[in-house]
């Protein structure tokens, strides 16, 4: 679809005569008839296949024709066509004399024709005007013409329809050849596809308008490249949605069980070495001079009674010092200057000579100790009670008073709160320092796993065609992430095939 435009510029009829040679009275009031038709080697009679147009009276005898396009007037003359421009044409322009106001052919005098021109040729679509001048014996006509495409038509022959748009069906303008030129942020054959935010993950993200990145279920982040872990996951991460892969030192379904109490809480004091011994359980190995569950108590070095043979111990800044009784010497008064002849063994101890009488050894009766049997046995000296238990002397024996949560002769055993199987629905019981904790299976919660919560919706393998199943524990539902070529809530339909239902 396009328009053949004809711009009449000047008509010269100096003598004011008709084609018959007869003069016009009083002058030739001139109007034009134009016929545009398909190319003919010889311009022939017949329909004006590309259209006709007539002008009003434009002037008398000789005159210039005013360009009246701005006022919506009749110059240039418009000959619209609604087919592919063939590139060739025949053009007939007739100048007629109209004595009165009626320009119909039957109303004109028999010899009203002033002049007639007929041209044929080729003409490409374009903005440039072709200037032409036709001269006969008595008249001259100067004019120009061109072919331009109608609005929304493009190409060499105005055959390509292209209407710019910015809506659901496309976002584009039209190039001079009629091809689409997408608006910024759009792509695709018809510019219907938004260009998502740069870096937006191809599979996990999408967009409905340019520079957007909307995440598919199970994904988050500005570029939808971060998976969403299991709801309630505390100290864990994921590589695919709804996972909860525990960080080092954490365990349990939600990675909220502390398996590395030593690192996370540093309970051991005074440079003691900490060893993990179970969930929220640890043991501190104290440096010399310290005691207590957490090695928080400073020991006097004399508390271990290092001085032998009745020597007395004195604490010093850098250790201790033994003051030996007469007849003894050495760091711990361990060397004797006495022999059995000196009756050195107290409390009924019997003396045995050694090294040919140069030394001796005392064999002590029960309840006495020391190199000279001079000490009553204190069974708590070796600190035999574990886990902070208090040692008590009871005559010939000793006993440990245990801290809550511990039992056994030496408080070496945890009191097992788990012994009575307090965790319901197959929950796993863990002893804690002050109580217990239940790790519940999927679908149960509460301190004793007594509350039914959600189930693993993926357990039944609802997704087809090797789709990946993600459980959303917050809603007890599953989401199937389809591989390429499959669609449907369970990825059950191949793309392009309508579902067939059994009913």
């Amino acid at each position: 679809s396009g328009v053949f435009q004809l711009q009449l510029q000047e008509f010269i009829n100096e003598r004011g005569v008709l084609a018959s040679g007869r003069p016009c009275e009083p002058g030739c009031r001139t109007f034009f008839r134009v016929c545009l038709k398909h190319f003919q080697a010889v311009v022939s009679p017949g329909p004006c296949t590309f259209g006709t147009v007539s002008t009003p009276v434009l002037g008398t005898n000789s005159f210039a024709v005013r360009d009246d396009s701005s006022g919506g007037g009749r110059n240039p003359l418009q000959l619209p066509f609604n087919f592919t421009w063939p590139g060739t044409f025949s053009l007939i322009i007739e100048a007629w004399h109209a004595p009165g106001d009626d320009l119909r052919p039957e109303a004109l005098p028999p010899d009203a024709l002033i002049s007639k021109i007929a041209i044929q040729g080729s003409l490409a679509v374009g903005q440039n005007w072709l200037l032409d001048e036709q001269t006969s014996t008595l008249t001259r006509l100067r004019y120009s013409y061109r072919v331009i495409c109608s609005d929304n038509y493009y190409g060499d022959n105005c055959s390509r329809l292209c209407k710019k748009r910015n809506d659901h069906f496309g976002h584009y303008v039209c190039q001079p050849d009629g091809n689409l030129s997408c608006l910024p942020g759009w792509t695709g054959e018809y510019c219907q596809q938004p260009i998502c935010l740069s870096g937006c993950h191809e599979q996990n993200g999408y967009c409905s308008k340019p520079a957007e990145c909307l995440c598919r279920p199970g994904w988050q982040g500005r570029l939808c490249n971060e998976c969403i872990p299991h709801n309630g996951c505390r100290h864990g991460t994921c590589s695919t949605p709804w996972q909860c892969t525990c960080d080092e030192g954490w365990g349990g379904l939600f990675c909220d069980q502390d398996l590395n109490y030593c690192t996370h809480h540093s309970p051991c004091k005074n440079g003691a070495t900490c060893s993990n011994s179970g969930q929220r359980s640890y043991t501190c190995t104290c440096r010399p001079g310290y005691t207590g569950v957490d090695c928080e108590l400073e020991l006097s070095e004399c508390d271990s009674n290092p001085c032998r043979n009745g020597g007395s111990c004195k604490d010093q800044e850098d250790g201790y010092h033994c003051l030996c009784p007469p007849g003894y010497y050495g760091l711990h008064c361990e060397h004797s200057t006495l022999s059995c002849a000196d009756s050195p063994c107290f409390n009924g101890g019997s003396c045995r000579e050694r090294n040919q009488g140069a030394n001796y050894a005392c064999e002590c009766p029960p309840n006495f100790t020391g190199s000279n049997c001079e000490k009553k046995v204190d069974r708590c000296t070796s600190n035999p009670c574990a886990n902070g238990g208090q040692c008590l002397n009871r005559g010939p024996s000793r006993m440990c008073r245990c801290r809550p949560g511990f039992t056994g002769t030496y408080c070496e055993l945890h009191v097992s709160d788990c012994a009575r199987n307090p965790c319901a629905h197959g929950g796993t019981c863990h002893d804690l320092e002050n109580g217990l904790m239940c790790t519940c299976p999927a679908g149960f919660s509460g301190r004793r796993c007594e509350v039914r919560t959600s189930i693993d919706a993926c357990a039944s393998s609802p997704c087809f065609n090797r789709a990946t199943c993600y459980t959303d524990l917050s809603t007890d539902t599953f989401v199937c992430n389809c591989p390429y070529g499959f669609v449907g809530s369970r990825c059950e339909f191949p793309v392009g095939l309508p579902p067939s239902f059994p009913w």
Epitope: A19, V42, P45, G46, P47, I92, L108, P110, A112, K116
Partner: antibody, heavy 119, light 111 residues
């Protein structure tokens, strides 16, 4: 009143020539074309060709080309057809008719001229 | 050349009845949406008279009972109510290509 008046009947010997006239009135002669049409006795119509009264451009039916010539005289608004090397099968009524670029068709016809070719 | 074939060769119709004449071209006579087809009426001893041009347009002074239709290769002239003065030979003619050609004619008579 548009009129096309043709010259009278002609009797010619084989091999001779004949020139028929068609005088136009009542319209602008130079704006139109003049067609020539043959009708043999008891037969249908046969198109011979046309001439543009404006510039003298012609278009002939190949069947008659070489034996026929169209001319016009704009000063007298008259068209002519000359047919040479006459044969007996040229015996026919010859019509002139006017036509225009804006396709009404051959809307006015002359009354016809009978040409008889006989030895 | 484009050959124009008319049918029937002759047609006898009662007064006031419909008469239909067909014309088939050996190739399409349409160009740029226009049919280069005309119909003429010729009464005995008279020149032909233009009835229809461009397949369906009535010539000047032609009665409304004459109508034309068709496109491409098949065309029809219809006389909706035959009158005594309609007795004549009717010709179709194409002007798409030189040489312009006429159909063989259809003779319409009163039954």
């Amino acid at each position: 009143q548009v009129q096309l008046v043709q010259s009278g009947a002609e009797v010619k010997k084989p091999g001779a020539s004949v020139k028929i006239s068609c005088k136009a009135s009542g319209y602008s002669f130079t704006a139109y074309y003049i067609h020539w049409v043959k009708q043999a006795p008891g037969q249908g119509l046969e198109w011979i060709g046309y001439i543009s009264s404006y510039n003298g451009a012609t278009n002939y039916n190949q069947k008659f080309k070489g034996r026929v010539t169209f001319t016009t005289d704009t000063s007298t608004s008259t068209a002519y057809m000359e047919l040479r090397s006459l044969r007996s099968d040229d015996t026919a009524v010859y019509y002139c008719a006017r036509d225009y670029d804006y396709d009404v068709g051959m809307d006015y016809w002359g009354q016809g001229t009978l040409v008889t070719v006989s030895s | 050349d484009i050959v124009m074939t008319q049918s029937p060769d002759s047609l006898a119709v009662s007064l006031g009845e419909r008469a239909t004449i067909s014309c088939r071209a050996s190739e399409s006579v349409d160009n740029y949406g226009i049919s280069f087809m005309k119909w003429f009426q010729q009464k005995p001893g008279q020149p032909p008279k233009l009835l229809i041009y461009a397949a369906s347009n009535q010539g000047s002074g032609v009665p409304d009972r004459f109508s034309g239709s068709g496109s491409g290769t098949d065309f029809t002239l219809t006389i909706s109510s035959l009158q005594a003065e309609d007795v004549a030979v009717y010709y179709c003619q194409q002007s798409k290509e030189v040489p312009w050609t006429f159909g063989g004619g259809t003779k319409v008579e009163i039954k």
